[in-house]
Interface confidence: low
């Protein structure tokens, strides 16, 4: 009688992650008596996947009823496949022995390849904000896909970007792969509402790419422009000076008024107006009692925006043009923000 052969008819099997893999195996004879075991890999480091005789294998089911006397079909199904299940699976016949069964013959092996979807791309921007005209880098990462072939594109507000570098890891064979891309983006003053998009296309996505986004509002800092103007006299001996803070982002801003270099008042931008491009405007007033000054007054509006070094704008107030009232010692009044001062 011809010696038993273990036949694994499929050289390779391709399965999508989450699905069930069927690994086929048949024996050509019932003799010798003994169990079948399935292994992933060969040699001493191989992993036991299924043992007909004993053990608990929650993800593995047999195709046929192995308890039937004449059964020669030892095919198995492995459920809920992940990329980590990729590898070569061997169906091995053992001969009944005492005390232990002895390996008798192995099938040629079936290579299980897994198609796995990439994870949702995660886009991250620079750690610190940057100002318009500067170039900043964005990274995009996606993991866990198989096979290795993948396409990644970058967009800013729908326009494809060309300045980027992409790597797929690892370089050699692996159960699953990761992609990492870095794109360079030049910021403009209009970018508060802009978005950077990373788009990943893979065979498992059936033409419906995955996208990750980053809002440039998290990245950009638009420094303010300052304008100090003197308003018409509100009352005799009083001059109203305004500091217009325009086109800044983000909102975090502190303003300090200085009279001849001495701090008169500090306030934080609260009630701001928003421009169409997402930047903010704000205005602060200072009511100066000119009768308290003998000489001309240098008024400075100093602004610290988003933790950056202060910028300032000055205005010279000519005291000589106003009659001086004796006995008054108040140089300036706290007026607060534009919400509380409607002149």
């Amino acid at each position: 009688e011809e010696e038993l052969q273990v036949i694994q008819p499929d050289k390779s099997v391709l399965v999508a992650a989450g699905e069930t893999a069927t690994l086929r195996c048949t024996a050509t004879s019932l003799i010798p008596v003994g169990p079948i075991q399935w292994f992933r890999g060969a040699g001493p480091g191989r992993e036991l996947i299924y043992n007909q005789k004993e053990g608990h294998f929650p993800r593995v089911t047999t195709v046929s009823d192995l308890t039937k006397r004449n059964n020669m079909d030892f095919s198995i199904r492995i459920g809920n496949i992940t990329p980590a299940d990729a590898g070569t699976y061997y169906c091995v016949k053992f001969r009944k022995g005492s005390p232990d069964d002895v390996e008798f013959k192995s099938g040629a092996g079936t290579e299980l390849s897994v198609r796995a979807k990439p994870s949702a791309p995660v886009v991250s921007g620079p750690a610190a904000r940057a100002t318009p005209q500067h170039t900043v880098s964005f990274t995009c990462e996606s993991h866990g896909f198989s096979p290795r072939d993948i396409t990644l594109k970058w967009f800013k507000n729908g326009n494809e970007l060309s300045d980027f570098q992409t790597n797929v890891d690892p370089v050699g064979e692996s159960v699953s792969y990761s992609i990492h891309s870095t794109a360079k983006v030049v910021l403009t003053r209009e970018d508060v509402h802009s978005q950077v998009i990373c788009e990943v296309a893979h065979v498992t996505l059936q033409g419906d790419p995955l996208r990750g986004t980053a809002n440039l509002s998290e990245t950009i800092r638009v420094p303010p422009t300052l304008e100090v103007t003197q308003q018409p006299v509100r009352a005799e001996n009083q001059v109203n000076v305004t500091c217009q803070v325009r086109k800044f982002y983000p909102q975090r801003l502190q303003l300090t008024w200085l009279e001849n270099g001495n701090v008169s008042r500090t306030e934080t931008a609260s009630t701001v107006t928003e421009n169409k491009d997402g930047t903010y405007n704000w205005m602060s007033w200072l009511l100066v009692n000119v009768s308290a000054h003998r000489d001309d007054v240098k008024l400075t509006c100093q602004v610290e925006h988003d933790g950056q070094p202060a910028v300032s704008k000055s205005h010279d107030l000519k005291v000589s043009a106003h009659p001086k009232e004796q006995g008054s010692n108040t140089a300036a009044e706290n007026t607060g923000s534009n919400e509380r001062n409607i002149y």
Epitope: H56, R59, A84, H143, P170
Partner: antibody, heavy 122, light 107 residues
Framework: EVQLVQSGAEVVKPGASVKLSCKAS????????MHWVKQAPGQGLEWIGA????????TYNQKFKGKATLTVDKSASTAYMELSSLRSEDTAVYYC???????????????WGQGTLVTVSS | DIQMTQSPSSLSASVGDRVTITCRAS??????LNWLQQKPGKAIKRLIY???SLDSGVPSRFSGSRSGTDFTLTISSLQPEDFATYYC?????????FGQGTKVEIK
């Protein structure tokens, strides 16, 4: 044959840091989670955390966050664990052990390194 | 975190004895439990995975079983090389946790 070879014993002063290594051979290194386990003298085993070399994804036991930092050098098939701000209670043998990513049950904690003894002493 | 309560913490037995070590999980872990063997100065060795599957090269006198959240390691006939410390390890949920260990000593 898969082998995990760990770096040699270390004696370090309190407050200092130490970086342990675990070199894998005999298989595709990147396909596995590399775990680290602590065993204080005369005590049981405690899981510290794990790293997945493909993308350096890490998972930590909350107890060891801030104490242990796991990194990997894929090209050298080596995993590292840095222990910082060392105190006497960090004196222990530290083991690396390997598990397949989302594995079939067969691959969890199957291979173990020989362990590295870290002694914290002034 | 899942607590693994292992008992006894130590036991004395003779060669040829039947030895049973148990581990109780504080919540359902399915069958995701390993049994490990540790000998002084040697690398830790996994004996059993998925509750009852014997690792390659592990003698058949070792066996594992489960009843709900109670897990048992049985050595049917203790041999001189089996004197060691045994740990259970759950890998159902991170952080992965070990039992406190059982030291098997010679009587």
């Amino acid at each position: 044959e898969v082998q995990l070879v760990q770096s040699g014993a270390e004696v370090v002063k309190p407050g200092a840091s130490v970086k342990l290594s675990c070199k894998a051979s005999g298989s595709t290194f990147t396909s596995y989670w590399m775990h680290w386990v602590k065993q204080a003298p005369g005590q049981g085993l405690e899981w510290i955390g794990a790293i997945y070399p493909v993308n350096s994804d890490t998972t930590y036991n909350q107890k060891f966050k801030g104490k242990a930092t796991l990194t990997v050098d894929k090209s050298a098939s080596t995993a590292y664990m840095e222990l910082s701000s060392l105190r006497s209670e960090d004196t222990a043998v530290y083991y690396c052990t390997r598990s397949f990513y989302y594995s079939l049950d067969a691959a969890w904690f199957v291979y173990w390194g020989q362990g590295t003894l870290v002694t914290v002493s002034s | 975190d899942i607590q693994m309560t292992q008992s006894p913490s130590s036991l004395s037995a003779s060669v040829g004895d039947r030895v049973t070590i148990t581990c109780r999980a504080s919540q359902d872990i399915g069958s995701r439990l390993n049994w490990l063997q540790q000998k002084p100065g040697k690398a830790i060795k996994r004996l059993i995975y998925a509750t009852s599957s014997l690792d390659s090269g592990v003698p058949s006198r070792f066996s594992g079983s489960r009843s709900g959240t109670d897990f048992t390691l049985t050595i049917s006939s203790l041999q001189p090389e089996d004197f060691a410390t045994y740990y259970c390890l759950q890998y159902a949920s991170s952080p992965f946790t070990f039992g406190q260990g059982t030291k098997v000593e010679i009587k």
